[in-house]
Amino acid sequence: TQNKALPENVKYGIVLDAGSSHTSLYIYKWPAEKENDTGVVHQVEECRVKGPGISKFVQKVNEIGIYLTDCMERAREVIPRSQHQETPVYLGATAGMRLLRMESEELADRVLDVVERSLSNYPFDFQGARIITGQEEGAYGWITINYLLGKFSQKTRWFSIVPYETNNQETFGALDLGGASTQVTFVPQNQTIESPDNALQFRLYGKDYNVYTHSFLCYGKDQALWQKLAKDIQVASNEILRDPCFHPGYKKVVNVSDLYKTPCTKRFEMTLPFQQFEIQGIGNYQQCHQSILELFNTSYCPYSQCAFNGIFLPPLQGDFGAFSAFYFVMKFLNLTSEKVSQEKVTEMMKKFCAQPWEEIKTSYAGVKEKYLSEYCFSGTYILSLLLQGYHFTADSWEHIHFIGKIQGSDAGWTLGYMLNLTNMIPAEQPLSTPLSHSTYV
């Protein structure tokens, strides 16, 4: 007689990543009886919410409900109805909301309050919406990639089942780039973490980890651009800004009020004799790179070594997974291959930025212009940040792996966040149990 498949004993979890430029909803699934095993949770769905980040709804909070509707309805479809009430929903907001909170705690609270009310209307087990710290964002990103790479499991394998696996238990560092902040997180080699703010201690699956992390607020790719524009417009002789970070022939009018709206440009703010200025692209990688470097203050360091702006950074150690915008930008530029050297990446960026805007629009006809215009700046910014900001070299470049997904799950902080909040990462190594009955069926 044929064996009948027993009903799947699975659980689901939902995490919304409320980033500065957009919100994404992730649905995770795992076998109920294997909650404490490493690597069993996987992503079954990603839904990108159409529209900007939640911090942009500060003047129109009544539209937050409609904004979240399509993705929450998608979650209702994907997760079996019988599981709805026991499926936890978490929303974590990152640097866009940190910046809003710096401007007004009251406005940030109002946005989160409406988000909470909207999410409470769904049949899931809503667990709250909060602004996570930069330290948490870095830590959870590090947990996610190492969990997915199998770095926390004690079993050593003679074969590799996941990409990038070096068959040892040495963890990967995590490099995360968002729109408003960027995080660097790794285990330094026998190095004291000189600043307590950057030190994390974890005990995971019976092993202790001393982890360095830092989140650079205002150094995500979007806020870095606003910083650069605010810095450069200070010395412009009129309302034309000839910008090497945009393609030759590209033109864009920017409102000065938009430029100074973010706390990230406050240090460059000045009274200008015009309300608007026009960016005119000149497409020069080297000049763009030089302009970006002026955003990193490397003249002051109260520690043995620093990244920039006086922030401690230990010597880099081991392999790194670079994800989120590090991956999206480099993937667009076709520069994610392990075989592409740093020199080659720089060469390709020089050629790309020098291409006329009209040519670029023709070559990438399917890409929205507002995104297409960003890649010269963003690619140059990534190189500047990794090389001059974090001190990667031409040699250590090969230790950076640009990662979008690992085993079908997106690299990012959301999985680590859910694993932590659902207590699915034990401090001690779970005892290996005999096969459960479900294994025999």
């Epitope: 957009h22 159409k50 539209e63 509707t69 399509d70 938009d258």
Partner: nanobody, 122 residues
Framework: QVQLVESGGGLVQPGGSLRLSCAAS????????MGWYRQAPGKQRELVAA???????NYADSVKGRFAISRDNAKNTVYLQMSSLKPEDTAVYYC????????????????WGQGTQVTVSS
């Protein structure tokens, strides 16, 4: 730039019905959602109903069960079917295109129609 033009307003008795239309000069697919707002004299503009590009709808509690929003993508038009109208529904009704994401996280522009008057009175 997409222009939005509302029509269908007028004077109606309590308990009556009206159907408002909002015609867009360009594709309504350029918006993430389309919404109907209203503004009564001396009051703030409030969201009445909205429909997403995915076809999901949201309503203000005060109109649930009485109003229905729909869209005809081929005609680039959004409708608001209003029934069981009450005097407190009297207002200028505005159509809004709720936009997409923008250049480097810039604030997105709001696209509004000029409004159509709805008066519920016996």
């Amino acid at each position: 730039q997409v222009q939005l033009v509302e029509s269908g307003g007028g004077l109606v008795q309590p308990g009556g019905s009206l159907r408002l239309s909002c015609a867009a000069s360009g594709s309504i697919f350029s918006f993430n959602a389309m919404g109907w707002y209203r503004q009564a004299p001396g009051k703030q503009r409030e969201l009445v109903a909205a429909i997403t590009s995915g076809g999901n709808t949201n309503y203000a509690d005060s109109v649930k069960g009485r109003f229905a929003i729909s869209r005809d993508n081929a005609k680039n038009t959004v409708y608001l079917q209003m029934s069981s109208l009450k005097p407190e529904d009297t207002a200028v009704y505005y159509c809004k295109g709720i936009g997409g994401s923008t250049w480097f996280g810039e604030d997105e522009p709001d696209y509004w129609g000029q409004g159509t008057q709805v008066t519920v009175s016996s």
